[in-house]
């Protein structure tokens, strides 16, 4: 099941996705697409990186974080109800069938008549790089698999700091991180 994120009409939506490059500059191509991750590539690509740069993008989509250090989280500007749906973040690790695929469900809510900051919005602003594994337990490290010359690990960061936070109760699965190298 995909991880769910929420935003209001007119806000920017934030869909987290991270990996850790093995060494400075050893980047892995990433694609973001609208729709669940297919077997290969991304369907309906909205943004793509190569081994150096963002080399394809569409107008309202960008990577606001430090993507050359592995923060490939997607920002969608000024969302509308039509932006609801599943988005695919695909870390295109070299080798056959080595890609890591993350499906993230974006739910767009109508804008409130009286604008008031929501807890979710406060959280995103306060912890833009927040990652946890599934559930809200202590930080854990789970081996996803081994590949030739590549260790692939799903890691959880900030979980300890947030475990006792009132915000933690409001969070569902908050992103995915893999380590390469």
């Amino acid at each position: 099941s995909e991880v769910e994120y929420r935003a209001e009409v007119g806000q920017n939506a934030y869909l987290p996705c991270f990996y850790t490059p093995a060494a400075p500059g050893n980047l892995v191509p990433v694609c973001w697409g609208k729709g669940a991750c297919p077997v290969f590539e991304c369907g309906n690509v909205v943004l793509r990186t190569d081994e150096r740069d963002v080399n394809y993008w569409t107008s309202r989509y960008w990577l606001n974080g430090d993507f050359r250090k592995g923060d490939v989280s997607l920002t969608i500007e000024n969302v509308t109800l039509a932006d609801s749906g599943i988005y695919c973040c695909r870390i295109q690790i070299p080798g056959i069938m080595n890609d890591e695929k993350f499906n993230l469900k974006l739910v767009i809510k109508p804008a409130k008549v009286t604008p008031a900051p929501t807890r979710q919005r406060d959280f995103t602003a306060a912890f833009p790089r927040m990652l946890t594994t599934r559930g809200h337990g202590p930080a854990e490290t789970q081996t996803l698999g081994s590949l030739p010359d590549i260790n692939l690990t799903q890691i959880s960061t900030l979980a300890n700091e947030l475990r006792d936070s009132r915000l933690a109760n409001d969070l569902r699965d908050s992103g995915a991180t893999i380590r390469i190298g």
Partner: antibody
Framework: QVTLKESGPGILQPSQTLSLTCSFS??????????VGWIRQPSGKGLEWLAH???????RYNPALKSRLTISKDTSSSQVFLKIASVDTADTATYYC????????????WGQGTSVTVSS | QIVLTQSPTIMSASPGEKVTLTCSAS???????LYWYQQKPGSSPKLWIY???NLASGVPARFSGSGSGTSYSLTISSLEAEDAASYFC?????????FGGGTKLEIK
């Protein structure tokens, strides 16, 4: 101490090939993440990015000029080269080489620039 | 490609004034890779601000940078005579890398 120094022909004629050399010290292009790029600036105007070459020989070119540009490196002699084919008067500018690093500050060191005039 | 539009093109201000230069991107870019350079006549550009808000070595604390997405700015809290120069924004988030047209800052 990081230094970069550009050298070029100074003056050349339209349709010729411009060859520029960037000689640098204080860093190595064999270091993972390191790169060297070329920027130009016509007199009194803005900056235009031309090309980059990285430690692993990945190359990037300005698409508007890509068909005329060739960037290369000689890591052992700490030099980067840029060739611009079929020059015309619009290529008259000061050419700078710059050091970059992929995950920190880019273009943190610039050469003094070399002036190139294309004239018949 | 990402077009960076700087405004104003030329501005004149008095010592002690607060000055803000803006850089607008045609599409959103990573704030980690939005840079500002200062250039004085006859000299090479100098890295001034990197990653939107980080001051390069030796840059006075009266300078600051901010922004995200498509809108970025460089602010001088109290202008000094030595700040007279041209300022260029630059992005190397998206290929091809691009520069803004520059803002020439003059002192009254």
């Amino acid at each position: 101490q990081v230094t970069l120094k550009e050298s070029g022909p100074g003056i050349l004629q339209p349709s010729q090939t411009l060859s520029l050399t960037c000689s640098f010290s204080g860093f190595s292009l064999s270091t993972s993440g390191m790169g060297v790029g070329w920027i130009r600036q016509p007199s009194g105007k803005g900056l235009e990015w031309l090309a980059h070459i990285w430690w692993d020989d990945v190359k990037r070119y300005n698409p508007a000029l890509k068909s005329r540009l060739t960037i290369s490196k000689d890591t052992s002699s700490s030099q980067v080269f840029l060739k611009i084919a079929s020059v015309d008067t619009a290529d008259t500018a000061t050419y700078y080489c710059v050091r970059t690093f992929i995950t920190t500050t880019t273009m943190d060191y610039w050469g003094q620039g070399t002036s190139v005039t294309v004239s018949s | 490609q990402i077009v960076l539009t700087q405004s104003p093109t030329i501005m004149s201000a008095s010592p002690g004034e607060k000055v803000t230069l803006t850089c607008s991107a045609s599409s959103g870019i990573s704030s980690s890779y939005l840079y500002w350079y200062q250039q004085k006549p006859g000299s090479s550009p100098k890295l001034w601000i990197y990653g939107t808000s980080n001051l390069a070595s030796g840059v006075p604390a009266r300078f600051s940078g901010s922004g995200s997405g498509t809108s970025y700015s460089l602010t001088i809290s109290s202008l000094e005579a030595e700040d007279a120069a041209s300022y260029f924004c630059h992005q190397w988030s998206n290929y091809p890398y691009t520069f803004g047209g520059g803002t020439k800052l003059e002192i009254k």
